[in-house]
């Protein structure tokens, strides 16, 4: 399946010339990524990332998805993608629309994970998974 479609999803990447990430964070394209080893629900995962001065990852390009898949263990990780049931569409937490494909969709699965498969997978927001946080490199 086509994970990303070719239309503009309304997200503009922030230009950053930094290359320094905190300890335990991974650097990619002027951004820093933290892959947790503990697990929690999606809401708690959002708060977890906030506590590190970051947000759940916005995986809005195929290159970023591949980078993260390459460094994930055989685990599922929450990302900053949620299903807006009233709109019948997926949005990133920065409110930009995701027009690509999400597998494993179910009326109770309103959050998304990456990691075990090559795609974005719908998941219950209440189940505990690891999480990927993202922030600007300094």
């Amino acid at each position: 399946p086509q994970i990303f479609n070719k239309s503009n999803d309304g997200f503009t990447t922030t230009r950053s010339y930094g290359t320094v990430c905190p300890k335990d964070w991974e650097f990619y394209q002027a951004r820093c990524f933290f892959l947790s080893t503990s697990e929690s629900s999606w809401n708690e995962s959002r708060d977890f990332c906030k506590g590190k001065g970051s947000t759940l990852a916005i995986v809005n390009t195929p290159e970023k998805l591949k980078f993260l898949q390459d460094i994930t263990d055989a685990e599922k990780y929450f990302i900053g993608l949620i299903y807006h049931r009233e709109e019948k569409r997926w949005r990133w937490i920065n409110n930009s629309v995701f027009n690509g494909n999400v597998t494993n969709q179910n009326q109770n699965f309103n959050c998304a994970t990456i990691g075990l498969t090559k795609t974005f997978d719908a998941a219950s927001c209440d189940i505990s998974y690891r999480r990927i946080c993202e922030k600007n490199a300094k």
Epitope: P22, K23, F48
Partner: antibody
Framework: QSLEESGGGLVQPEGSLTLTCTAS?????????MCWVRQAPGKGLEWIAC????????SYYARWAKGRFTISKTSSTTVTLQMTSLTAADTATYFC????????????WGPGTLVTVSS | NIVMTQTTSPVSAVVGGTITINCQAS???????LSWYQQKPGQPPKLLIF???KLASGVPSRFSGSGSGTQFTLTISGVQPDDAATYFC????????????FGGGTEVVVK
């Protein structure tokens, strides 16, 4: 899950000592750092150093500890702290603590081992 | 390096009362790096609160944490005699440039 320190005791000024921290009930892995913290008699806690408990060999030190103290992971269950050029100011109870990399807290502590520097 | 400054000791409490202990960071920190510990004489510290407000496993709910930026607070509601101890805050992040830092400790006396 527990930690236990060993190797403390009486040491002469300018002497050296190596403390060992042994983990039981869990393996040292990528989820943790292992740290040393000390407490002089009647005083507060002072962070000394931490080392990655997993595949990385990264170690981090308090500025005052660099050069005189060396932290090392020596096996899947042990971490050591080598101390040199000891003075009376180093007299303290030395604690080993497990540092959670996700939450940046020290969630498991050993009972401590007393180091006394005196002639 | 970040310096953590705590409420001056000792703090007196009455059984059933409420006390707060403050911890001030010398510069703004992410709340995810702040934890609280209880230590009794002859014992190692015990983790009470992590991520500024999350209760560690097995810790009574009368303990709570709050705060952000430079100001953090540990609150004990319904103080018990067993709560007599010294309490430390910890800025738990370290790297090649900065170290973890404990507050100086606050002794709590229960009357």
């Amino acid at each position: 899950q527990s930690l236990e320190e060993s190797g403390g005791g009486l040491v002469q000024p300018e002497g050296s000592l190596t403390l060992t921290c042994t983990a039981s009930g869990f393996d040292l892995n990528n989820y943790y750092y292992m740290c040393w913290v000390r407490q002089a008699p009647g005083k507060g806690l002072e962070w000394i150093a931490c080392t990655h408990a997993g595949s990385s060999s990264s170690s981090y030190y308090a500025r005052w500890a660099k050069g005189r103290f060396t932290i090392s992971k020596t096996s899947s269950t042990t971490v050591t702290l080598q101390m040199t050029s000891l003075t009376a100011a180093d007299t303290a109870t030395y604690f080993c603590a497990r540092h959670d990399r996700d939450y940046d807290d020290m969630d498991l502590w050993g009972p401590g081992t007393l180091v006394t520097v005196s002639s | 390096n970040i310096v953590m400054t705590q409420t001056t000791s000792p703090v007196s409490a009455v059984v059933g009362g409420t006390i707060t202990i403050n911890c001030q960071a010398s510069q703004s920190i992410e709340y995810g790096y702040l934890s609280w510990y209880q230590q009794k004489p002859g014992q190692p510290p015990k983790l009470l609160i992590f991520y500024a407000s999350k209760l560690a496993s097995g810790v009574p709910s009368r303990f709570s944490g709050s705060g952000s930026g430079t100001q953090f607070t540990l609150t004990i509601s319904g103080v018990q005699p067993d709560d007599a101890a010294t309490y430390f805050c910890l800025y738990g992040y370290f790297d090649d440039y900065s170290g973890a830092a404990f507050g100086g400790g606050t002794e709590v006396v229960v009357k």
